[in-house]
């Protein structure tokens, strides 16, 4: 067998993480980069992350913003760190609603 | 559900030839390396070959380098094994098995296939 | 090539007991180890991946450890469905499998 490493998957990219399911993380690891956007119990809710494998992105990177919930998803490195997720009434804010970014 | 399926598999003579396909399902086919792996009935397990997601690349286990081809056709989703020049210790159960796809590099199998029986025997 | 050495090849068990699998590599290959079980006419089925992560639906009475070159799967209480060949293979540089730990009814 050769020596060198081989090449069998598609590139991971590193992506900016923030939300819950982060933990202590600050970054993570997959196929896709995300940033979303949803509104949780009147407050507007921004996490950042990755999906590791193309399956876990597949439904939610192609499913349009709706005005709950909004997902932008990328492929390179950090390509989530200045994205920021938009709900379709873009420049309206909901009545009742403020914005929360999820640590 | 991610499944499996080898053909292909039967009774050869040495030195002939003979081709196995794993059709796949139940995940992004065109994502994920692919490997085949074979078993002697009673024995232990041997890795043969991988492919990468995009079959630009292709690597063999010493034992069957020059003689096998690993290949795949994305558009249907299907994984292949051309073996040439047979013998009889290739006689196996081949696995195709599904690469994890959390390294580059390759990783663990997370699924496999029932397996296809060759026999190489005069 | 690493070479993955199982040991016992057989172990006999009885049902409701532990049993202590161990697999060496002949050079470091951090915690990128699997351990699969295999029963008679049946492909091998993903039990532990990372060294000791579980794989989904792998009962709790599964349980893999070690790093670096040595590494252990502990069942700590056979179940009847639980006899078979156990195989671990390294994935750290290229792949290669162990022998084999067939777990039988003592």
């Known amino acids: 067998m050769e020596d060198e490493k081989p090449k069998v998957n598609p590139k991971l990219y590193m992506c900016v993480c923030e939300g819950l399911s982060c933990g202590n993380e600050d970054h993570c690891e997959g196929q896709q980069c995300f940033s979303s956007l949803s509104i949780n119990d009147g407050f507007h809710v921004y996490q950042k992350g990755c999906f590791q494998v193309y399956e876990q992105g597949k439904m939610t990177c192609k499913t349009p913003p709706s005005p709950g919930q909004a997902v932008e998803c990328c492929q390179g490195d950090w390509c989530n760190r200045n994205i920021t997720a938009q709900l379709p009434t873009k420049g309206k804010s909901f009545p009742g609603t403020q914005n929360f970014h999820l640590e | 559900q991610v499944h499996l399926v080898e053909s292909g598999g039967g009774v050869v003579q040495p030195g002939r030839s003979l081709r196995l396909s794993c059709a796949a399902s139940?995940?992004?086919?065109?994502?994920?390396?692919i490997h085949w792996v074979r078993q002697v009935p009673g024995k232990g397990l041997e890795w043969v070959a991988v492919?990468?997601?995009?079959?630009?690349?292709?690597y063999y286990g010493d034992s069957v380098k020059g003689r096998f081809t690993i290949s795949r056709d994305n558009s249907k989703n299907t994984l292949y094994l051309q073996m040439n020049s047979l013998r009889p210790e290739d006689t196996a159960i081949y696995y195709c098995?599904?690469?994890?796809?959390?390294?580059?590099?390759?990783?663990?199998?997370?699924?496999w296939g029932q397996g296809t029986l060759v026999t190489v025997s005069s | 090539e690493i070479v993955m050495t199982q040991s016992p090849a057989t172990l006999s068990v009885s049902t409701g007991e532990r049993a202590t699998l161990s697999c060496r590599a002949s050079?470091?290959?951090?915690?990128?180890l699997a351990w699969y079980q295999q029963k008679p006419g049946q492909a091998p089925r993903l039990l532990i991946y990372?060294?000791?992560t579980r794989a989904s639906g792998i009962p709790a009475r599964f349980w893999g450890s070690g790093s670096g070159t040595e590494f252990t799967l502990t069942i700590s209480s056979l179940q009847s469905e639980d006899f078979a060949v156990f195989y671990c293979?390294?994935?750290?540089?290229?792949?290669?499998f162990g022998q084999g730990t067939k777990v039988e009814i003592k």
């Open positions: 098995a599904k690469d994890r796809g959390l390294d580059t590099a390759g990783d663990y199998f997370d699924y």
């Open positions: 139940g995940f992004t086919f065109s994502n994920y390396g």
């Open positions: 492919i990468s997601y995009d079959g630009n690349n292709k």
């Open positions: 050079q470091n290959i951090s915690s990128k």
């Open positions: 990372g060294a000791s």
């Open positions: 293979l390294q994935y750290n540089n290229w792949w290669t």
